[in-house]
């Protein structure tokens, strides 16, 4: 017939299954004069032939794996062999059959994995090839682990991505693999074609030997670095190594320093980039991180400790330009006048900061020189020769040489002779009550004001008050500054408060004079006061990296397929546990450690896409604070819904007897996605026996006409089966039934005697 198997010369495409012996011609081209013959050129492979009269055929079975498309050209020639039409392209598409089995590229694979490697991160790929068409099930491969040897406690340590062949550790494998216990494993892996879904799929197996290696991602020993180094920088100080090459290293400064003098190169070598100053900062703690090429951490960060070693690069410094001490008139020989505390910024308790004190001059030398002595190492001034008289000499000036092992400094001390100290400081309140503060209250904050008074000579060491915390603050988190004019004490935070180590502190203050009390007078309860400091915990919830996470998968993914993942971090650095909320369809599960989301049930786009669930990130430990983010799973359509009738067609009737052949129109639909052009259904009768009575013809992609072929129908109901094909990939077919009644009519409607069956047809044709 013209059209399907014969016709004029024009570009055409034909699809032929491979492996089939030729059974019919491909096409008969018709010549228009003056054309008398046809010529075939292109990728004929001596298989495709055109006869002189235009008969195109093939002479042996095709093989898609040799050539999947034959690009041919056909030209019409006149009697002289001159092209008068064409050449036109003729494309032969060779359709695939499952005539090739999958084969692994290797019969044995070898790989290694580090203990504690991240679960789900591939460390080895097995790879099989199947010469069949990967766009069809024939070439779609499905990988599986058949057996793991040894299998300890029936726990799988390894898993395989059934589509990619990527082998990785399970969560149990990440936690439990230990080369000291079991250094090697063997897996038997199978691969099947037909997506693993068919009984007649071909398969192959391979063996995988896996060596478990030690994890060398370990924190190095603490480093000591001498300050003020004059060597050229940067200087390598230590190193970290990821287990495999190619890691991207970085350093994280948890302290957020304005100047961070360290760097790391892509070998994992850590450098100090400039000379350090111990007096600026004597120790550094930071973290080394290893990431993969996508910026994803390969493991936990390593803590790096750097201690800065001291050199004697600081001279002693005087506490002030002039240090003022007071001595009471009647003090006895040997009494302490005060201690000159010079400072040295070099490291405490080392020779670099060990100071010597020596008096080099006293003025006036009245009534004699050498009235004072200073303890060589302690710096304590003492009355050396006799008691002093205020009316004779009310003030002495001393020059004191303070030295460390390399430097000398002169300090100046003024000693005032004052009245006797016979009054003690008295607190205006003995109990300052409770004070509640958050643990993140700023250092330097004044949290309390205290006040004591002293009746001795004003503005002398006898009336000046020093406040000390004598109990309840062994860590030295608090301090008290005194206003010298009012003797008011301001309690300030010197070190960060810590809920974990000191939630409640019972603080006791003592008020004392710098000058000793006269003999017989003692400090009593009036010079003491207390208060209670309550510290509250501060905690921040984990933070998700995105407000909404989105992933896209085909609705037909295998159960257990990873469909997405979420990430959150805890500001306090606590581990995070992930969970799902609102998984109303029970389609998903989340790995509570990694945040990877897997399917646990068949997905269905037609039930609704995107599928929205909430993901919850909860701190592990601490106050278990949690945050919520959205996960949207976009489901891509596959052709998994057969066509059906668009509405209920019960009640179709023809008036009996038919005066002429009649017809009715019906509509089909399906639930799959039809982008742009809408469905393209084809319609045919559901069984051969119907063809004598009925005919079905397509009107458009969704509508068809059912027509009677004659008028000789009985007065009864006929059930006409219609086959509707959606032409999808794979094509799905629905067989629907149209009940058509032939009945006697009254005024164009079916007549039924009273009491007859229910469900009277209501639509006449």
């Amino acid at each position: 017939q013209e059209g399907k198997f014969s016709g004029p010369l024009k570009p055409m495409t034909f699809s032929i299954y491979e492996g089939q012996e030729p059974s019919q011609i491909i096409f008969q081209f018709k010549a228009n004069p003056p054309a008398v013959t046809f010529e075939l050129t292109g990728e004929t492979d001596n298989i495709f032939v055109i006869e002189r009269e235009g008969l195109l055929y093939y002479n042996r079975a095709l093989d898609r794996e040799t050539r999947s498309t034959h690009n041919l050209q056909v030209a019409a020639l006149d009697a002289n062999g001159i092209i008068v039409e064409g050449p036109v392209p003729i494309t032969i598409k060779v359709k695939d059959i499952n005539d090739n089995r999958p084969t692994f590229l290797q019969s044995k694979y070898e790989g290694s994995v580090r203990q504690n490697s991240r679960p789900g991160k591939p460390f080895l790929y097995v790879n099989a090839t199947d010469l069949d068409d990967p766009a069809t099930p024939n070439g779609q491969l499905y990988y599986q682990i058949v057996i793991q040897l040894p299998m300890i406690n029936n726990v799988m340590y390894f898993q395989i991505n059934n589509k990619t062949g990527a082998i990785s550790l399970t969560r149990e494998g990440s936690q439990e693999l230990n080369p000291a216990k079991n250094p090697s494993y063997n897996l038997v892996i199978s691969v099947k074609d037909m997506g693993g879904q068919s009984e007649n799929s071909f398969s192959d197996t391979t063996s995988v030997d896996i060596i478990v290696t030690e994890n060398i991602w370990k924190a190095p020993k603490p480093v000591e670095m001498v300050e003020n180094s004059t060597d050229p920088h940067p200087i390598k100080i230590t190193q970290v190594r990821w287990n495999d090459p190619g890691a991207q290293y970085s350093l994280v400064d948890k302290e957020k320093l304005p100047r961070f003098p360290f760097s790391i190169d892509q070998e994992g070598d850590i450098y100090v980039t400039q000379p350090l100053d111990r007096e600026e900062k004597d120790a550094y703690v930071f973290y080394a991180v290893a990431k993969d090429e996508y910026g994803k951490p390969l493991s936990y960060p390593l803590e790096i400790h750097v201690k800065v070693k001291d050199i004697n690069d600081n001279p002693p410094t005087c506490p002030s330009p002039v240090t003022v001490f007071e001595v009471q008139e009647n003090e006895r020989l040997g009494n302490s006048i005060g201690t000159l505390t010079a400072h040295d910024r070099d490291e405490e308790n080392t020779a670099n900061s060990f100071l010597n004190y020596r008096i080099v001059e006293q003025t006036p030398k009245l009534p004699m020189d050498g009235l004072f002595l200073i303890q060589t190492y302690a710096g304590m001034l003492q009355l050396a020769k006799q008691s002093l008289k205020k009316q004779d000499t009310p003030q002495y000036n001393l020059t004191i040489e303070v030295s460390d092992k390399d430097f000398k400094t002169l300090c100046f001390v003024q000693i005032n002779v004052i009245d006797i100290n016979d009054q003690i400081p008295i607190f205006e309140k003995s109990d300052y009550g409770n004070l509640t503060l958050a643990e993140d209250t700023n250092i330097g904050s004044t949290i309390l004001t205290i006040q004591a008074t002293d009746a001795d000579e004003p503005f002398t060491g006898s009336s000046k008050i020093l406040y000390h915390i004598i109990k309840g603050d062994s860590e030295g988190r608090l301090g008290v500054d005194t206003d010298p004019h009012t003797n008011t004490g301001y309690v300030i935070i010197k070190k960060p408060l810590d809920f974990e180590t000191a939630a409640v502190s019972n603080i006791v203050f003592k008020a004392e004079n710098p000058e000793p009390l006269v003999f017989g007078v003692k400090y009593n309860a009036s010079s003491f006061a207390k208060f209670t400091l309550i510290v509250t915990d501060v905690n921040e919830a984990p933070q998700f990296s995105q407000h909404v996470f989105q992933a896209k998968v085909s609705e037909d993914v295998a159960i257990g397929t990873k469909v997405g993942n979420v990430t959150a971090k805890d500001p306090e650095g606590l581990d995070i546990s992930y969970s799902l909320r609102g998984d109303t369809r029970g389609w998903l599960k989340i790995d509570h450690v990694t945040g990877e989301i897997f399917s646990v049930a068949p997905l269905d786009r037609e039930a609704g896409s995107p599928y929205r669930v909430q993901v919850v990130a909860t701190e592990v430990g601490g106050s278990s604070l949690s945050s919520v983010s959205e996960f949207h799973l976009i489901l891509m359509d596959v052709n998994d819904n057969p066509p059906r009738l668009a509405k209920d067609y019960t009640g179709l009737f023809f008036c009996h007897p038919l005066s002429a052949p009649g017809s009715l129109i019906f509509e089909a639909t399906d639930d799959d996605q039809h982008l742009f052009r809408g469905p393209h259904f084809t319609f045919s009768l559901g069984s051969g026996s119907l063809q004598n009575d009925w005919e079905v013809s397509k009107i458009n992609g969704t509508h068809a006409r059912l027509s009677t072929r004659h008028t000789e129908f009985e007065e009864r109901e006929y059930v006409v089966l219609i086959r509707i094909n959606d032409g999808g990939r794979p094509p799905l077919e629905g067989i629907v039934s149209l009940p058509v009644t032939f009945c006697s009519c009254v005024e164009g409607s079916c007549f039924r005697p009273a009491g007859h069956q229910t469900g009277i047809p209501t639509v006449g044709m």
Partner: antibody, heavy 123, light 113 residues
Framework: QVQLQQSDAELVKPGASVKISCKVS????????IHWMKQRPEQGLEWIGY????????QYNEKFKGKATLTADKSSSTAYMQLNSLTSEDSAVYLC????????????????WGQGTTLTVSS | DIVMSQSPSSLAVSVGEKVTMSCKSS????????????LAWYQQKPGQSPKVLIY???TRESGVPDRFTGSGSGTDFTLTITSVKSEDLAVYYC?????????FGGGTRLEIK
């Protein structure tokens, strides 16, 4: 061997007609086209047209339409060219030639020629 | 119609000399589908019918001496005789078979000095 034997020289009066023959041998007559050329002394060759005996397809040079008529007799393997309304301008040597191409061959040229027929038109 | 122009119309050479003659067409003879030039060269000796030398512009017919060479493409073609012999005295025609009506050039007459 292939031969194309043309009819003998003709002397005809102006206004008359003449039919020149070209009898072939040594190959299947219907496989190849037969072409006719006109050659006047000291002038080049002019292509008149061809006939394909198998399907009796003809094609003419527009210049010779109405002047020449090409026919073939398969039974005698002979091609004919009739020239009518003759004038002195038609005086020339007329050559038949076989075009080398046939289905499956690649000979795109005139491979065999007749010996020529001299036509003289004179009163 | 495609007009074929040959030059020179005649030339005289001594035996052993090289000779080239030109043939130009009024439109391209190169067919896009097969990249062939639809041109042939013929030799017509005195008192004889023409005989093919070259077809497809450069393919030498079997039995033709290799001193005859055809070249060119599109609209410009050349016939070269590398070492003329006395038996090469003839008129040489080019002919196009790209489109009907087929046409011949006016010919180049080769004379021997």
């Amino acid at each position: 061997q292939v031969q194309l034997q043309q009819s003998d020289a003709e002397l005809v009066k102006p206004g008359a007609s003449v039919k020149i023959s070209c009898k072939v041998s040594g190959y299947t007559f219907t496989d190849h086209t037969i072409h006719w050329m006109k050659q006047r002394p000291e002038q080049g060759l002019e292509w008149i047209g061809y006939i394909y005996p198998r399907d009796v397809i003809t094609q003419y040079n527009e210049k010779f339409k109405g002047k020449a008529t090409l026919t073939a007799d398969k039974s005698s393997s002979t091609a004919y060219m009739q020239l009518n309304s003759l004038t002195s301008e038609d005086s020339a040597v007329y050559l038949c030639a076989r075009w080398g191409y046939f289905y499956g061959s690649r000979s795109y040229y005139f491979d065999y020629w007749g010996q020529g027929t001299t036509l003289t038109v004179s009163s | 119609d495609i007009v074929m122009s040959q030059s020179p119309s005649s030339l005289a050479v001594s035996v052993g000399e090289k000779v080239t003659m030109s043939c130009k067409s009024s439109q391209s003879l190169l067919h896009s589908s097969n990249q062939k030039n639809y041109l042939a060269w013929y030799q017509q000796k005195p008192g004889q019918s023409p005989k093919v030398l070259i077809y497809w512009a450069s393919t030498r017919e079997s039995g033709v001496p290799d001193r005859f060479t055809g070249s060119g493409s599109g609209t410009d073609f050349t016939l070269t005789i590398t070492s003329v012999k006395s038996e090469d005295l003839a008129v040489y025609y080019c002919q196009q078979y790209y489109s009907y009506p087929w046409t011949f050039g006016g010919g180049t007459r080769l004379e021997i000095k």
